[in-house]
């Protein structure tokens, strides 16, 4: 039977080294055996490159394409092939479809004056355009109470958040995770970082009386 694409490729770039495209076939497909995604930068002399897709689900394919350090002018021509059959053709401009890398190394440290200091690493080297463009969202949630969660927007430069222990329940276990986005690139949010967990041992003031 003929091979058909149900949902055409949707692509995002981390704007440093990788672009990822995902699409859905109309029936379960062995992506790596049956399909190829070719990509070529629209630039004089560029070569055609081939990406071998992997299965994310039965009928969902994903291709990770190594790209050079992206610049705004870059536009790629994409062609999805099943053998000699062209299933889909389109173009992709990484600067218009940015999904930042996930922030790393999230840690929680006790700080002065009953505060917690949450720290993480900017996933981009200083020379990359996105390094100074990221803002963050930190999600703090009570491990035993799904209703007890807080969201903090970190819009200043440093990858840190100071959290008053008094804003959290004493003796409760909390988890935090962080994600990033780049406003000037109108990016999507990055994936969430792995969670880090700690015990909030702050003693409310009333207990001192």
């Amino acid at each position: 039977g003929s091979v058909k694409v149900l949902h055409e490729p949707s692509c995002f770039s981390d704007y440093i080294s990788t672009s990822v495209c995902q699409w859905k076939m109309d029936h379960p497909t062995n992506c790596s055996a049956e399909l190829r995604l070719s990509y070529q930068l629209d630039f004089m002399g560029s070569e055609n490159h081939t990406c071998v897709p992997e299965n994310r689900e039965d009928s969902v394919c994903v291709c990770s394409m190594p790209i050079d350090d992206a610049v705004e002018a870059d536009v790629y021509q994409l062609d999805l092939w099943a053998g000699q059959q062209l299933l889909w053709s389109g173009s992709f401009q990484p600067s218009k479809h940015v999904k930042p890398r996930t922030p790393g190394n999230l840690t929680v440290h006790p700080n002065i004056s009953h505060t917690w200091l949450l720290m993480w690493t900017n996933p981009y080297p200083t020379e990359n355009h996105l390094h100074s463009e990221l803002t963050y969202m930190v999600n703090v949630s009570n491990d035993n109470d799904p209703e007890d969660f807080k969201v903090y927007n970190v819009t200043y430069m440093g990858p840190t958040l100071r959290l008053a222990a008094s804003t959290l329940k004493s003796g409760a276990s909390y988890s935090a995770r962080v994600r990033a986005w780049a406003q000037t690139y109108n990016s999507t949010w990055s994936d969430w970082s792995p969670s880090t967990t700690w015990l909030n041992y702050y003693e409310p003031w009333e207990q001192h009386l």
Partner: antibody, heavy 125, light 112 residues
């Protein structure tokens, strides 16, 4: 030492054909795009054609499009220019030159960093 | 197509002086910040052309630092300081950004 040696230039009648060759040495030929540039007697330089490292993509000046074909044999480190339907205005010294490195996703550009000595093509009846 | 225009078309300079050649393109040659696809070439009498400057300002291998390129977008300049007799020849600018590649008309440099 990086070197390019052209050959194949000759006197040919209008409407005739000729094939120029350019043998490369001293660098990884398949990693680089190659270009032909010509120079009519007493005139300036005119770009003719470019081919990328794999040979999969070619580009031509309007003046030669449909008449000239650029190709390469990476196993022989050789660049070619097949010239058909030649005209008097094609009379020129033809140079081959090493162009951008196309092995990377975005070609690395160094200009036309090595040129051959040139081969003379004369189209006259 | 991108049209390249050089000025002046001829130039006479005394040894030790500085020579400047201008090149203007009909479209911007900037692909991204710092990447201007503009080259300078020298063709000495009876010889093949040789590369001097690429990407607007980078000197080709073996080119003395007396040769410098500057500019961005559509306006570029080649400067040759402390001109020597050996610098005589025709200087060409060329855009390498898009097909068809194109050269300027050439500037003939004569040493007095």
């Amino acid at each position: 030492e990086v070197q390019l040696v052209e050959s194949g230039g000759d006197l040919v009648k209008p409407g005739g054909s000729l094939r120029l060759s350019c043998v490369a040495s001293g660098f990884t030929f398949r990693d680089y795009a190659m270009t032909w540039v010509r120079q009519a007697p007493g005139k300036g330089l005119q770009w003719v054609s470019l081919i990328n490292g794999s040979g999969g993509k070619t580009y031509y000046a309007d003046a030669v499009k449909g008449r000239f074909t650029i190709s390469r044999d990476n196993a022989k480190n050789t660049l070619y220019l097949q010239m058909n339907s030649l005209r008097a205005e094609d009379t020129a010294v033809y140079y081959c030159a090493v162009d951008r490195k196309t092995k990377t996703i975005r070609p690395q550009y160094y200009g036309l960093w090595v040129w051959g000595q040139g081969t003379l093509v004369t189209v006259s009846s | 197509d991108i049209v390249m225009t050089q000025t002046p078309l001829s130039l006479s300079v005394s040894p030790g002086e500085t020579a400047s050649i201008s090149c203007r393109s009909s479209q911007s040659l900037t692909y991204s910040i710092g990447y201007n696809y503009l080259d300078w070439y020298l063709q000495k009498p009876g010889q093949s052309p040789q590369g001097l400057i690429y990407l607007g300002h980078k000197r080709a291998s073996g080119v003395p630092d007396r040769f410098s390129g500057s500019g961005s977008g559509t306006d570029f300049t080649l400067r040759i300081s402390r001109v020597e007799a050996n610098d005589t020849g025709v200087y060409y600018c060329m855009q390498g950004l898009q097909s068809p590649l194109s050269f300027g008309q050439g500037t003939k440099l004569e040493i007095k």
